[in-house]
């Protein structure tokens, strides 16, 4: 709001730009015939200091010289870096009601001389790019500072460009707009940056470079891969490069990987054969280029090429298991199960499995293909049967995996000993065992198999199993293990033509059951009482039930109840007790116990035995 200094002038000594820590004198003078009307002696000049348009100080007390009614000089000190505005105003003291009138103003800039620019770095992107240099300007000057970038080279080549820094923009990079060509590859160039502002100037040290030092090739483009004879492991990577490139770096990795495979290729001319790819795998490929074997810089990495390698026929063998059940007097149902191949073995999308069931002596063969990982057939109970399964993708099939169908628990002498199951954590059970004591034939392998002790269908709920080498006596089972569920675990010892097994129950975590068994009936037979019950529903068991307890006491008695503890067997749902007095009414109830504790009691039943005392 300063009205172009109609009333007077403001001047600064030594200058409107001063170094940090310096003082300045500001003089405010009225023009002739300007001032307070009628009473020139009543002219009072005041100086106001503004920072960021905010009044911060009235410098009334800083007057160092005063020509009453005409001019005043003020000394200002301790100015902070940057720009400060000073406004001179005229105060006519005979008129208290009128505010002071602006006379004129001045901006004082406080700053520092520029430091010599450092760390000059120049690049030319691509053979056809232009030279651009960047530098470190040093401390902020708080003043408008001009920078000049000068380049000199062979054949009197000179070139310069300028830019400036102030409080709105920073100048630390300039593009000279000239192109250095490969025919100047051996020549030396010198660049220097000079900085100038109102407080001084400085120059960088000269920075010397050659064409090879600064030219960064453009990243390769148009990357593609050609798989030889649709091979999943061999491919030729092709790309376009600038003409002078002599060295390439290739990097590639499967998409879910965290480490790159790196390859250096000399004089590749846009082509390189890769031989170690994994079939049917999503890969990412990138390429970088360099113009000289020893000197120069690598280009940025190219854009990624993402592609999937073709399929190859599956390798590896399927992990097969089976279940055998007699379904009538001379037939058995064989359910075969197998685990999917892992991706490195499948080497493609598995389209189907080829299943063969063969009777060894009569040469009867049943064959089928299925897309599922199980297959069931009804076959005669007689004969020695063998099964094989192979996996097929679009390129071929894996070698068939064979398994002899034997009576898995048929040979007592092959039953493993001292089987135990310990919960390791929420989703693991450690199973340990000792080898069979008197096996007729050598154990070829152990199979640890587990199923939840919950009703399930045979094929919708296939078994879970682990194959264990014959010299191992433990297995940590974790697949499909959930807390608070009891599992029946079998350890099978298999020889060439026989099998023996031992069972145990185990859980990974347990709580006391939610409820006790429900007593359904109490019957008296031959002076004994038979207690019948229904088992606790599976979701309420909360782990493996170790035993049931039957409690009884005389009705209305305050004495502690008697109890009978029976080992839990799913097949058992009644138990006799024989220590009750005849013609006495008893109250009976049951509880269930897991390793975590006892359930609340189940329903109470009253009963009065009629028989003779035992």
């Amino acid at each position: 709001n300063i009205d172009v200094c109609k009333l007077g002038t403001v001047t600064v000594q030594p200058a409107p730009v001063i170094p940090l820590g310096s003082a300045a004198n500001i003089s405010c003078s009225l023009n002739p015939k300007q001032g307070c009307s009628h009473y020139p002696s009543s002219n009072e000049l005041i100086l106001l200091k503004f920072v960021n348009d905010v009044l911060v100080e009235n410098l009334h007390g800083k007057k160092v010289h005063d020509h009453t009614g005409h001019s005043s000089t003020f000394q200002v000190t301790n100015l902070s870096l940057g720009m400060t505005l000073f406004v001179c105003k005229l105060n006519c003291s005979n008129s208290q009601k009128k505010p002071p009138v602006p006379v004129c103003g001045v901006e004082i800039s406080v700053g520092v001389a520029p430091e010599p620019p450092q760390n000059i770095s120049c690049v030319q992107e691509g053979e056809n790019g232009t030279v651009a240099c960047s530098w470190n300007s040093g401390k902020v000057t708080y003043l408008k500072t001009n920078y000049t970038l000068q380049l000199s080279g062979p054949n009197n080549l000179t070139c310069q460009k300028q830019c400036f820094s102030d409080n709105r923009q920073n100048c630390n990079r300039l593009d000279l707009g000239i192109n250095l060509s490969p025919d100047l590859a051996e020549s030396r160039f010198i660049v220097r940056v000079t900085a100038i502002n109102d407080l001084g100037n400085s120059s960088s040290l000269p920075h010397t470079f050659t064409f090879l030092d600064i030219v960064i090739p453009l990243p390769p483009w148009d990357i593609r891969i050609n798989f030889l004879n649709a091979s999943g492991s061999r491919g030729t990577l092709q790309w376009e490069d600038e003409g002078q490139v002599v060295l390439n770096q290739l990097r590639y990795q499967p998409l879910n990987s965290t480490s790159w495979n790196m390859v250096n290729a000399t004089n590749a001319k846009g082509k390189y054969d890769l031989r170690d790819l994994r079939p049917f795998t999503e890969y990412e490929f990138q390429i970088s280029s360099k113009l000289h074997l020893s000197g120069g810089s690598w280009s940025n990495w190219s854009e990624s090429l993402r592609t999937r390698t073709p399929e190859e026929e599956p390798v590896g063998i399927l992990d097969i298991w089976y279940m055998k059940q007699d379904i009538d007097y001379d037939r058995q149902q064989i359910s075969l199960f197998w685990k999917s191949l892992n991706p490195s073995e499948a080497r493609g999308k598995i389209l189907h499995y080829q299943v063969t069931l063969q009777e060894v002596t009569k040469k009867t063969t049943l064959q089928n293909t299925t897309r599922h990982t199980s297959w069931t057939r009804v076959i005669p109970r007689t004969g020695a049967w063998t099964a094989s399964v192979s996996a097929a993708n679009s390129k071929g099939a894996s070698a068939p995996t064979h398994i002899n169908i034997v009576d898995l628990c048929g040979t007592g002498l092959l039953a493993p000993h001292q089987v135990s199951a310990k919960s390791e954590n929420m989703d693991n059970i450690l199973v340990t065992w000792q080898p069979p004591k008197k096996a007729d034939s050598a154990v070829r392998e152990y199979i640890v198999e587990w199923r939840a002790l919950q009703p399930g269908s045979i094929t919708k709920f296939p078994p879970h199993w682990l194959r264990i080498p014959p010299d191992n006596m433990s297995a940590l089972i974790s697949e499909n293990i959930k807390p608070y569920i009891c599992y029946e675990i079998r350890v099978h010892a298999l020889s060439e033509s026989q099998g023996g097994c031992s069972s145990i129950r185990g859980d990974s975590k347990h709580k006391a059951p939610v409820s006790g068994p429900h007593i359904t009936a109490i019957t008296e037979k031959k002076e004994r009482l038979f207690i019948s019950w229904t088992h606790i529903p599976f979701p309420e068991q909360r782990g493996c039930i170790l035993h049931y307890r039957i409690y009884w006491k005389e009705r209305d008695s305050t004495a502690q109840p008697e109890l009978c503890e029976i080992q839990y067997r799913r097949s058992q749902n009644s138990h006799p007790i024989s220590s009750l007095q005849p013609r006495v009414t008893y109250v009976l109830w049951m509880t269930a116990v897991t390793a975590a504790g006892e359930s609340p009691q189940g329903n109470e039943r009253e009963f009065c035995p009629q028989g003779k005392a035992n």
Epitope: H372, W375, R490
Partner: nanobody, 119 residues
């Protein structure tokens, strides 16, 4: 528990056809494979056919090509279409399903439906 109820039996002439039905109720969440068995007078009960949840079927050799097992999961039902019936097919036909708890197989049976093939 699972309950099974058969129907559709009767008297039919040799060469004729019958369609047996079996409906499951109760704890059927774990039902998968469904079976038909038969028991002729004075003989042991024998397997006839079964079908899996994925509609894969298997038959007794002597009925293969004449009998067809099918299922309707929405109705919890399984069917046995019997064509070209022979006198030796005369038997009580039973519906069956099996559940596994741990390694123990629990079997559930219907009460049976009589099929008589006679001229």
């Amino acid at each position: 528990q699972v309950q099974l109820q058969e129907s559709g039996g009767g008297l039919v002439q040799p060469g004729g056809s019958l369609r047996l039905s079996c409906t499951a109720s109760g704890s059927i969440f774990a039902i998968d494979d469904m079976y038909w068995y038969r028991q002729a007078p004075g003989k042991q009960r024998e397997f006839v056919a079964y079908i899996t949840a994925t509609n894969s079927a298997n038959y007794l050799d002597s009925v293969n090509g004449r009998f067809t097992i099918s299922r309707d999961n929405a109705k919890n039902s399984v069917y046995l279409q019997m064509n070209s019936l022979k006198p030796e097919d005369t038997a009580v036909y039973y519906c069956n399903t099996k559940q596994i708890v741990g390694f123990q197989i629990d079997e559930y049976w219907g009460q049976g439906t009589q099929v008589t093939v006679s001229s």
